[in-house]
């Protein structure tokens, strides 16, 4: 669809005469009729296939035509067409004299024609005007013309429809050739596809408008490149959505079980050494001078009862001090001024002279101790139980009540599931958090390496001369079934050539 535009510029009829040569009275009141039709080698009368247009009276005799509307008419004249412009045309321009106000053809006398011009040729669509001038014996007409496309039509033939839009069906303007030019932020054949935020993950992100990045299920982050872990995942991460891969030191399906209580909680006090011993379980090894499950209790230096012979111990900032009873002296009241004559031994202890009677020693009955048998034996004072075990006095002896996971007289042994050698056939045993695991040697499998996995002894093709090989599952060895004419454990000897045995 387009418009053929004709711009009349000047008409000269100096003598004011009609085509017949007769003069107009009082002058030639001139109007024009235009006929546009398909190309004809010789322009002939007939239908104006591309359209017609008439002007009002534009002037008398000779005159210039203004570029705008004149007396209700328009200049340039518009001849619209609703088809593909063929590129060629024929044009007839007639100048007529209007004696009255009725310009219809049937109202005019036949000799009212002033002049008639006919042209034909090629004309491409374009903005530029073609200037032309046609002269007859009595008149001259100067005009220009062009073909332009109607709104929303583009291309060499005005055949390409393109209407700019910015809605759900597209976001574009039209180029001069009718191709779409997407508005910023849009792409695709019809500019319907938004350009997402730069860096938005191609698979995991999408957008409904430009510079947006909406995440698909299971993904998060500004660019939808971070997976969402499984709901409930505590100390874990993911590489694809809804996973939960535990961080170091955490276990359980939701990584909520602390396998490294020592590092995460630092329960041991006063410089003690912490050892993990299972889920939420640990053992503190105390430095000298401290005790308690977490080594939180400071041992008094008097707790070890360093004062002998009934001396009383006093804690001091830099140690302790023994107050000795009468008859004793020394740092620990270890020296006696008494002899056996003074009956220094208590609780039935027997006295023995030493250094020619200058000193003595008490031999104590069971359950009593001390230089003078003055102390009842408390076998738990030295904290003999390791790994947080509880010491119990049992008459003349003592025993340790161990925490779970420990054993031995003093709870010094970690319970090992591997101690009973559960892995068969030379399997290697590994202690795990709540059990054990066997690593089996070649040829064995199962939780305890108890299943013999047959080793294919025939895999190395040990039989010769097309013999058939069989694996003996009981010994993991092979047996060769020889074809006729061969003997030997590998069927390597032809019959008739006895093997040369070395014995």
């Amino acid at each position: 669809s387009g418009v053929f535009q004709l711009q009349l510029q000047e008409f000269i009829n100096e003598r004011g005469v009609l085509a017949s040569g007769r003069p107009c009275e009082p002058g030639c009141r001139t109007f024009f009729r235009v006929c546009l039709k398909h190309f004809q080698a010789v322009v002939s009368p007939g239908p104006c296939t591309f359209g017609t247009v008439s002007t009002p009276v534009l002037g008398t005799n000779s005159f210039a035509v203004r570029d705008d509307s004149s007396g209700g008419g328009r200049n340039p004249l518009q001849l619209p067409f609703n088809f593909t412009w063929p590129g060629t045309f024929s044009l007839i321009i007639e100048a007529w004299h209007a004696p009255g106000d009725d310009l219809r053809p049937e109202a005019l006398p036949p000799d009212a024609l002033i002049s008639k011009i006919a042209i034909q040729g090629s004309l491409a669509v374009g903005q530029n005007w073609l200037l032309d001038e046609q002269t007859s014996t009595l008149t001259r007409l100067r005009y220009s013309y062009r073909v332009i496309c109607s709104d929303n039509y583009y291309g060499d033939n005005c055949s390409r429809l393109c209407k700019k839009r910015n809605d759900h069906f597209g976001h574009y303007v039209c180029q001069p050739d009718g191709n779409l030019s997407c508005l910023p932020g849009w792409t695709g054949e019809y500019c319907q596809q938004p350009i997402c935020l730069s860096g938005c993950h191609e698979q995991n992100g999408y957008c409904s408008k430009p510079a947006e990045c909406l995440c698909r299920p299971g993904w998060q982050g500004r660019l939808c490149n971070e997976c969402i872990p499984h709901n409930g995942c505590r100390h874990g991460t993911c590489s694809t959505p809804w996973q939960c891969t535990c961080d170091e030191g955490w276990g359980g399906l939701f990584c909520d079980q602390d396998l490294n209580y020592c590092t995460h909680h630092s329960p041991c006090k006063n410089g003690a050494t912490c050892s993990n011993s299972g889920q939420r379980s640990y053992t503190c090894t105390c430095r000298p001078g401290y005790t308690g499950v977490d080594c939180e209790l400071e041992l008094s230096e008097c707790d070890s009862n360093p004062c002998r012979n009934g001396g009383s111990c006093k804690d001091q900032e830099d140690g302790y001090h023994c107050l000795c009873p009468p008859g004793y002296y020394g740092l620990h009241c270890e020296h006696s001024t008494l002899s056996c004559a003074d009956s220094p031994c208590f609780n039935g202890g027997s006295c023995r002279e030493r250094n020619q009677g200058a000193n003595y020693a008490c031999e104590c009955p069971p359950n009593f101790t001390g230089s003078n048998c003055e102390k009842k034996v408390d076998r738990c004072t030295s904290n003999p139980c390791a790994n947080g075990g509880q010491c119990l006095n049992r008459g003349p002896s003592r025993m340790c009540r161990c925490r779970p996971g420990f054993t031995g007289t003093y709870c010094e042994l970690h319970v090992s599931d591997c101690a009973r050698n559960p892995c068969a056939h030379g399997g290697t045993c590994h202690d795990l958090e709540n059990g054990l695991m066997c690593t089996c040697p070649a040829g064995f499998s199962g939780r305890r390496c108890e299943v013999r996995t047959s080793i294919d002894a025939c895999a190395s093709s040990p039989c010769f001369n097309r013999a058939t090989c069989y694996t003996d599952l009981s010994t993991d060895t092979f047996v060769c079934n020889c074809p006729y004419g061969f003997v030997g454990s590998r069927c390597e000897f032809p019959v008739g050539l006895p093997p040369s045995f070395p014995w």
Epitope: T245, L253, M437
Partner: nanobody, 120 residues
Framework: EVQLVESGGGLVQPGGSLRLSCAAS????????IGWFRQAPGKEPEGISC????????YYADSVKGRFTISRDNAKNTVYLQMNSLKPEDTAVYYC?????????????TGQGTQVTVSS
């Protein structure tokens, strides 16, 4: 393709028992630990039990200790959860899951779940 299919759920009275099964395919069953977790409406999921690839290590949440038992039959590629002394608070969708490794550490694949309802 890894697949875990749970079965055995249903309606049971308080104090009753159920045995859930998890049939696995698409991977070497003996290589992976398998566990169970549950999710009640409007609550976070709770890991309740897991068994290592060898079957040597099992663990239970405090809420089910002494009542639930997990076991595996590597020949049948199946893990079982025997649930005894069931309580109304055990009502949930029960899911079978595997971390994709031998130890019970995380979740990589899960099944579609089976509904357990404990009600009188």
């Amino acid at each position: 393709e890894v697949q875990l299919v749970e079965s055995g759920g249903g309606l049971v009275q308080p104090g009753g028992s159920l045995r859930l099964s998890c049939a696995a395919s698409g991977f070497t069953f003996d290589d992976y630990a398998i566990g169970w977790f549950r999710q009640a409406p409007g609550k976070e999921p709770e890991g309740i039990s897991c068994i290592s690839s060898s079957g040597g290590i099992t663990y239970y949440a405090d809420s089910v200790k002494g009542r639930f038992t997990i076991s595996r039959d590597n020949a049948k590629n199946t893990v079982y959860l025997q649930m005894n002394s069931l309580k109304p608070e055990d009502t949930a969708v029960y899911y079978c899951a595997t971390p994709g490794i031998a130890a019970c550490r995380g979740i990589h694949y899960t099944g579609q779940g089976t509904q357990v309802t404990v009600s009188s």
